[in-house]
Interface confidence: low
């Protein structure tokens, strides 16, 4: 049973964290069913669609305004109690974001990282923000709070993720907090995707017509591996984006994918990583590096036709 | 350089109140949370609560909720720690510390303390 | 509220010894943890911080090390002035508890 033995068990679907104008649903789980039940919040700004009402199963709250944030509990139908209800339910904090200025998110010493690595988020703004929030997406539990630090004019907090394993690889966002008002929530910082590398085989990586090409002739870098890898990501040393192409099967059994980087015009160090669809932010061991060499004359940049992906977006499906 | 300073020690009768100061030199007191550590004889350390001089916000260990006040003064750089209805087991040292910045900041730097002592 | 266990309490050593000592926190604090000396009658110095990082000023023989839940401070060779009481933190959420102490004291 998720509560005690008199107690239900109060829940919110998707998230605790909800957007200003946004829904939730709350579920009172009790009995190991859902029953009638009655909702209440624990401070003085009460919600006053709540009073009296009986709600069954669950309850969609909303649009949620900066007043729903706080602290609520449930009680349980309980017809033969004395007083007809359970025990109240455990507290579930319900945080209203959009209220503030988005802060930022930085990783240190960047978003890609080794599996056993650590990472620190460190989450900053020119709002004096008291606390700061981070949030993992598609995890419904409450996000880590740390208390902001003030210094030269901006707060900010760093929090450390690992050792990292698979699941702790997805997309943050964090949130801030003013004094006084610690569940009205700052709106949320752009979404930071952190990749864990090092999980699976590495693939290798070759160049068309070969590692060392003329200024301006066409460049292909092929991605490969017999692993069923869904998704190929290929990185330049030096550059903060990434390219990700689907992989293809080939008739020798591995999987492949293509990049054209147009015709040359400078040389780099290239390397890749396969992913799989389930799992899109956690990649595989890089590929042996590539130098890519350009004979003749040097530009400052190679043209992509390969759309490079933006700072976020690397755990979403391709579709 | 950094300095946390702090008054001299107080002898209460119980049920009396003391007033326990921290005066910071050396960096902008608004820029830093300041907090407060208690030791009683013998015994290991204790976070009592901080307060943020910016904002005025404070935070405490729920041990210590009705036992203390945090203030500050911006004007004079100065913390303040207020215990309430002493008992004889407020006896202890109290130190008042500054939460530094960077990653995943400690205190960096003390107060020397001031003894509390409680006695009929 | 985090617990913070720190072992042993009391610990008997020799100069040039190598030391260990250790802080289990009741959940993952991440790394944020810092190591604090303190000697009688004056108040704690800051000794180590974010787990591994050793403050300005202190020597090389101190070292930190750990993650998750368990950490370590590590002597490499006691000299006179180290006998003192050492105290773990943990900074990850309040109440910022700290660990009982450890008493290290010459053989």
């Known amino acids: 049973l998720m509560g005690g033995q008199d107690k239900p068990f109060l829940s919110a679907r998707p998230s605790t964290v909800v957007p200003r104008g946004g829904h939730v649903a709350l579920q009172c789980h009790y009995r190991r069913g859902f029953n009638n039940f009655m909702l209440y919040k624990e401070d003085r700004s009460h919600v006053p669609i709540f009073h009296g009402r009986i709600f069954q199963e669950s309850f969609i709250m909303g649009p949620v305004t900066p007043a729903h944030a706080g602290t609520y509990r449930c009680r349980g139908s309980r017809p033969h109690s004395l007083t007809g209800w359970s025990a109240p339910s455990n507290p579930l904090v319900i945080m209203v974001t959009g209220n503030h200025r988005k802060p930022s998110l930085l990783a240190h010493p960047g978003p890609l990282l080794k599996s056993g690595e650590t990472v620190i988020l460190q989450c900053w703004s020119d709002v004096m923000f008291e606390h700061f929030f981070l949030h993992r997406e598609g995890i419904s539990e409450d996000p880590s709070r740390l208390v902001g630090q003030i210094h030269d004019g901006v707060s900010k907090a760093n929090f450390s993720i690992g050792p990292l394993m698979p699941v702790l690889a997805g997309t943050y966002r964090c949130y801030g907090s003013v004094p006084h008002s610690p569940y009205q929530l700052s709106a949320p910082s752009d979404p930071l995707d952190i990749v864990i590398t090092g999980l699976y085989e590495k693939p290798s990586l070759s160049a068309q017509p070969g590692p060392t090409v003329q200024a301006g002739e066409n460049v292909t870098l092929s991605c490969s591996s017999w692993s069923s890898y869904d998704i190929y990501h290929l990185s330049r040393e030096g550059e903060a984006h990434e390219r990700r192409l689907r992989a293809v099967p080939k008739v020798n059994r591995t999987f492949q994918a293509d990049f054209p980087l147009g015709p040359a015009t400078h040389g780099g160090t290239y390397r890749c990583f396969g992913s799989f669809r389930a799992l899109p932010c956690v990649w595989s061991n890089s590929s042996d590096p590539l130098l890519v060499s350009v004979t003749g004359n040097p530009s400052s940049s190679w043209p992509s036709p390969t759309e490079p992906s933006s700072k976020s977006g690397i755990c979403r499906h391709l579709h | 350089q950094v300095q946390l300073v702090q008054s001299g020690a107080e002898l209460a009768r119980p049920g009396a109140s003391v007033k326990v100061s921290c005066k910071a030199s050396?960096?902008?007191?608004?820029?830093?949370?300041m907090h407060w550590v208690r030791q009683a004889p013998g015994q290991g350390l204790e976070w009592i609560g901080y307060?943020?001089?910016?904002?005025?916000?404070?935070e405490n260990n729920r041990k210590f909720k009705d036992k203390t006040t945090l203030t500050a003064d911006k004007s004079t750089s100065t913390a303040y720690m207020e215990l309430s209805s002493l008992r004889s087991e407020d006896t202890a040292v109290y130190y008042c510390?500054?939460?530094?910045?960077?990653?995943?900041?400690?205190?960096?730097?003390w107060g020397q303390g001031t003894t509390v002592t409680v006695s009929s | 509220d985090i617990q913070m266990t720190q072992s042993p309490s009391s610990l008997s050593a020799s100069v040039g010894d190598r030391v260990t000592i250790t802080c289990r926190a009741s959940e993952n604090i991440y790394s944020n943890l810092a190591w604090y000396q303190q000697k009688p009658g004056k108040a704690p110095q800051l000794l180590v911080y974010a787990a591994t990082n050793l403050a300005d000023g202190v020597p090389s023989r101190f070292s930190g090390s750990g993650s998750g839940t368990d950490y370590t401070l590590t002597i490499s060779s006691l000299q006179p002035e180290d006998f003192a009481t050492y105290y773990c933190?943990?900074?990850?959420?309040?109440?910022?508890?700290f660990g009982g102490g450890t008493k290290l004291e010459i053989k």
């Open positions: 933190q943990h900074f990850w959420g309040t109440p910022y508890t």
């Open positions: 307060i943020n001089p910016s904002s005025g916000y404070t």
């Open positions: 510390a500054r939460l530094g910045k960077g990653l995943l900041p400690p205190f960096d730097y």
């Open positions: 050396g960096y902008t007191f608004t820029s830093y949370t």
